[in-house]
Interface confidence: low
């Protein structure tokens, strides 16, 4: 076959070839930031000629042209300056209102290097209508000037700009315009990840977290799709695998989808994930009808097994078929559950389409979306039950109109995006479900957010460091766990009755500053000297305390609460039914067997997770008996005198050699990690052997080196009494 000519340089830019100079190869131009290539690409035809999509002359000279932002076509009830036909990158436009009108939105906007204006549409409004003046975004023309209930406004874009968002909006009874704000964009424009992540993330986080659907968030983003905590989400991930997607880019599609899956499974909802790859035909790698779709490990495994070569015989982009396979899946599930049942009707559906190009075979994907809307009975009342996110990747062949047509349109939200490359996509998925950015109403316990450049406290955001300074007696170091915005749970033995609040230092999130203490609340049954007369020098029963802080903690990536047993938060974290009892939680977290758990220890100023097994089955007795080897307990006749029912036991060499706690670990949480969440089941209290002499952990420890922890299920009445104003406990 002939090869295509090589005289295709672009003035001021560069180009890449997907398959060299051979027929079928896609030549992609790129330019420095602030410039865009014209044309964007050429395709090597089988005739050995370059074809330029949409061009009349096939080999017009490729050039890098300056990016420009669209000018306002009309601005009501005010003036804007300067008045230009279009604006250069870095150029500003300023807005002022006439008397009697108030400016809403951004008074000054700047043209960004991606051809998009920063800020928000400026509107001069006098508040006269039932709905606020919807404004006219830059580059748009609006018809319709009445803003009463039921009134409609229509938008179109000037010249060669592309409209994204709703071309028609209606003023609804609740004073909110239907659909989403229309934006006129240059065909070559794209979105920055830092804009997409919050837009996607806010929508998703509310779906996952459980805010009131009518409640306004701080960012005033209005209605956000949401899953009732008892509800169910079907998430459908559609990954483009057509010829124009390189193998490396497909890997990043997979990685991004994995990130999404990993995050979504750690929220408090029941979720099923479908994975579909597509080119000329779709391939369903995981269906929501498969029980494994509810299992994060299985879903990620099916993603990892997705093979780029699965579609090598069919290289087109059949978005219709991909969406139709979602429709067929929904149809099967509806027939299985029954169309009229709550089980079917209460499922929310979110589709994420990752594509690098426009659909080029199989008919209009909009038809499949219409079928999906029909089967889900999507109307104004059920609008929350479907969200379609259409994400185009690569500025090359992505069709804004098609993405906009496929993406959902909801007030204050965006569902269609174009990103510059797969790196940007990866970054969006990395940041879109950042728990620290979620609103205060979504206070998820036991949640962590891992970062490569993150600190130890990103991985253990509940961990608190406690230090008690005793003049002339040195100081005591302990750990604790943040359990609410005002309370840290720790061990009572870290303190004496003589310790004053000002001598107790608590820090969280790895911060250097110490928190002010209001009071330390001891369990009333704790008495270290309670059995001195019986020859037991130290008695650690009920060794728990709560530190009440003077000021409310500000939750963020490095400061978050751990989950406590028998709270509603833990029911949701474990995705158990809302009717779950305290006893059922106990059976879930502390079954009568060896239970994998962890504690957090500080080694050489680094926090490290240590995996241990709670001996709660046949090894429990031997674990507890080893308490006789503890200093001062060798004379105890009946070991239950010191190991009361309040204790959990770890350590020893079976089923595995457990690491041991050190002195400074006291008061820290003993944690069960389940369903991507962290639930505290114990408080580290005391150990049989000090394996940490000279601050160094000894490598070899005896088999009887056991550790004892206060079982939180055994001190629940006290926890509930002290924390009932800040946590919702189940009936005990």
């Amino acid at each position: 076959a002939p090869s295509c000519p090589q005289n295709v340089n672009i003035s001021g830019g560069t180009f890449t070839l997907s398959h060299g100079w051979a027929p079928g190869s896609l030549l992609t131009y790129s330019c420095p930031q602030g410039l865009y290539p014209s044309p964007a690409s050429r395709l090597c035809k089988s005739s050995g000629q370059w074809q330029t999509p949409g061009a009349t002359r096939s080999l017009s000279k490729a050039v890098c042209k300056p990016v420009r932002c669209p000018a306002p076509v009309s601005f009501e009830n005010g003036i804007y300056t300067p008045r230009l036909g279009s604006y250069p990158v870095g150029g500003n436009v300023s807005f002022e209102c006439e008397d009697g009108f108030i400016l809403r939105g951004s008074p000054v906007r700047q043209c960004r290097p991606n051809g998009m204006w920063d800020g928000e549409t400026a509107v001069c409004d006098n508040g006269a209508g039932h709905c606020p003046n919807p404004g006219i975004s830059l580059g748009a023309v609006r018809t319709g000037f009445r803003f009463g209930h039921g009134d409609k406004v229509r938008y179109r874009c000037s010249s060669n700009l592309v409209l994204t968002g709703s071309s028609e909006r209606e003023c609804q009874g609740n004073g909110v315009w239907s659909g989403t704000e229309p934006i006129c964009r240059q065909p070559y424009s794209y979105d920055f990840p830092e804009d997409v992540a919050p837009a996607l993330g806010t929508s998703f986080s509310h779906m996952l977290g459980a805010t009131n659907p009518t409640q306004k968030t701080k960012e005033s983003l209005g209605r956000k799709i949401q899953i009732q905590r008892s509800g169910h989400l079907n998430l459908y991930l559609l990954l483009d695998c057509s010829q124009s997607v390189s193998e490396n880019d497909f890997l990043i599609f997979k990685e991004s989808a994995s990130l999404m899956v990993d995050r979504i499974f750690s929220f408090e909802i029941n979720v099923s994930v479908a994975i579909i790859t597509f080119a000329s035909e779709p391939k369903v790698l995981m269906s929501v009808l498969n029980d494994n779709s509810r299992d994060m490990t299985e879903v990620i495994s099916s993603l990892e097994n997705a093979n780029y070569k699965d579609h090598e015989n069919g290289t087109g982009t059949n978005t219709y078929a991909a969406l139709n396979s979602v429709y067929l899946m929904m149809n099967n599930q509806m027939r299985l559950l029954g169309m009229e049942t709550m089980a079917w009707q209460e499922i929310r559906h979110a589709i994420i389409l990752l594509t690098d190009g426009k659909s080029n075979m199989g008919g209009s994907p909009k038809t499949a979306v219409d079928h999906i809307r029909e089967i889900l009975n999507i109307n104004q009342k059920r609008n929350d039950y479907l969200d379609i996110y259409a994400i185009g990747v690569g500025k090359l062949d992505v069709d804004w109109r098609e993405l906009n047509e496929l993406g959902s349109k909801k007030d204050g939200e965006r569902h269609a995006f174009i990103l510059q490359d797969t790196k940007a996509l990866h970054q969006v998925f990395e940041h879109m479900l950042d728990v620290s950015k979620l609103t205060d109403t979504i206070c998820l316990c036991g949640m962590v957010w891992e970062h490569r450049k993150g600190t130890d406290y990103h991985k253990q955001p509940w961990q608190a460091k406690i230090s008690v300074i005793r003049p002339s007696k040195g100081h005591e170091s302990c750990m604790g766990a943040v359990v609410s915005e005002y309370f840290v749970l720790t061990a009572a033995h870290c303190f004496t009755v003589d310790d004053k609040e000002h001598s107790i230092k608590v820090s969280v999130g790895g911060e250097k500053r110490d928190l002010e203490i209001e009071v330390v609340l001891f369990h009333p049954n704790y008495n270290i000297n309670g059995k001195k007369e019986a020859g037991i020098p130290e008695f650690y029963d009920y060794d728990v305390a709560l530190i009440k802080l003077k000021n409310k903690l500000k939750y963020g990536q490095t400061i978050r609460p751990i989950c406590l047993p028998c709270t509603e938060g833990t029911t949701r974290a474990l995705r158990l039914p809302p009717t779950t009892t305290c006893q059922q939680q106990k059976e879930e977290l502390l079954p009568a067997q060896d239970i994998k758990a962890l504690f957090v220890s500080e080694e050489e100023k680094k926090l490290t997770r240590k995996e241990v097994y709670i001996k709660n089955g046949d090894k429990k007795g031997s674990c507890e008996r080893d308490a006789q080897y503890a200093p001062g307990y060798d004379k105890v006749k009946d070991i239950s005198e010191v190991v009361t029912p309040r204790f959990l036991c770890t350590g020893g060499v079976s089923p595995y050699a457990d690491p041991n706690t050190c002195r400074g670990d006291s008061g820290g949480p003993l944690i069960v990690h389940k369903r991507s969440r962290f639930i505290q089941v114990g408080v580290i209290s005391w150990g049989v052997v000090d394996v940490c002499k000279n601050q160094k952990r000894q490598k070899q420890v005896p088999a009887h080196a056991r550790d004892f922890h206060i079982n939180l299920f055994q001190v629940l009445p006290w926890l509930k009494e002290k924390l009932q104003d800040v946590l919702n406990f189940l009936p005990l």
């Epitope: 990840p193 510059q420 790196k423 940007a424 970054q427 450049k453 600190t455 130890d456 790895g510």
Partner: antibody, heavy 118, light 111 residues
């Protein structure tokens, strides 16, 4: 004024280890990552790894993982880079470099020549 | 790893003339709206010196005859009017992700 002062030249035998120090002054030591870069005579620059002095978290070039160890002593504002199992091809000038807010190497030590020879 | 390839390996330019050095990355170094590409100058016996950060930002104290441009994978360092003290080796370096890598260097001589 920001200054990074490195320890003196070293001559080592193959198989031995070397530990290069880098004392920082003129800024808050824990505020910026410290990186280590090496340069063989007449050759280009090669990134070894970085350390966050505040949290002591490290990132390594895979090529040096297992052989290079980066540590800090916050109390004396000093970063260390130890390279073990030395070979003749490890003969190079080793630089410490402080990252700025943009992850660029804004300040460099004067370099430490490490010669590995039997 | 992201491989950075500089071109040319060496060049000779007359005093007062314009010098241009290119750096191509095997993967895009752009993220968060910034290009994590930096340029350094190194003279014999001295450590490198930062000239340009984030592709196009001049480090304070560096003469404004130095400029940087580019985005994604292709970057350029330009010296608008070469001075005698500009004879050195120039390196590009990315910090988009680990591991950070350098270009192989371009030796600039006065013609």
């Amino acid at each position: 004024e920001v200054q990074l002062v490195q320890s003196g030249a070293e001559v080592k035998k193959p198989g031995a280890s070397v530990k290069v120090s880098c004392k920082a002054s003129g800024y808050t030591f824990t505020d910026y990552n410290m990186d280590w870069v090496r340069q063989a005579t007449g050759q280009g620059l090669e990134w070894i790894g970085d350390i966050n002095p505040n949290y002591e978290s490290t990132g390594y070039n895979q090529k040096f993982k297992g052989r290079a160890t980066m540590t800090v002593n916050k109390s004396i504002s000093t970063a260390y880079m130890e390279l073990s199992s030395l070979r003749s091809e490890d003969t190079a000038v080793y630089y410490c470099a402080r990252e700025d807010d943009h992850d660029a190497f804004a300040y460099w030590g004067q370099g430490t020549l490490v010669t590995v020879s039997s | 790893d992201n491989v950075l390839t500089q071109s040319p390996d060496s060049l000779a330019v007359s005093l007062g003339e314009r010098a241009t050095i290119s750096c191509r990355a095997s993967k895009s170094v752009r993220t968060s709206g910034y290009n994590y590409m930096h340029w350094y100058q190194q003279k014999p016996g001295q450590p490198p010196k930062l000239l340009i950060y984030l592709a196009s930002n001049l480090k304070s104290g560096v003469p404004d005859r130095f400029s940087g441009s580019g985005s994604g994978t292709d970057f350029t360092l330009t010296i608008s009017s070469l001075q005698a003290e500009d004879a050195a080796t120039y390196y590009c370096q990315h910090s988009r992700e680990l591991p950070y890598t350098f270009g192989q260097g371009t030796k600039l001589e006065i013609k």
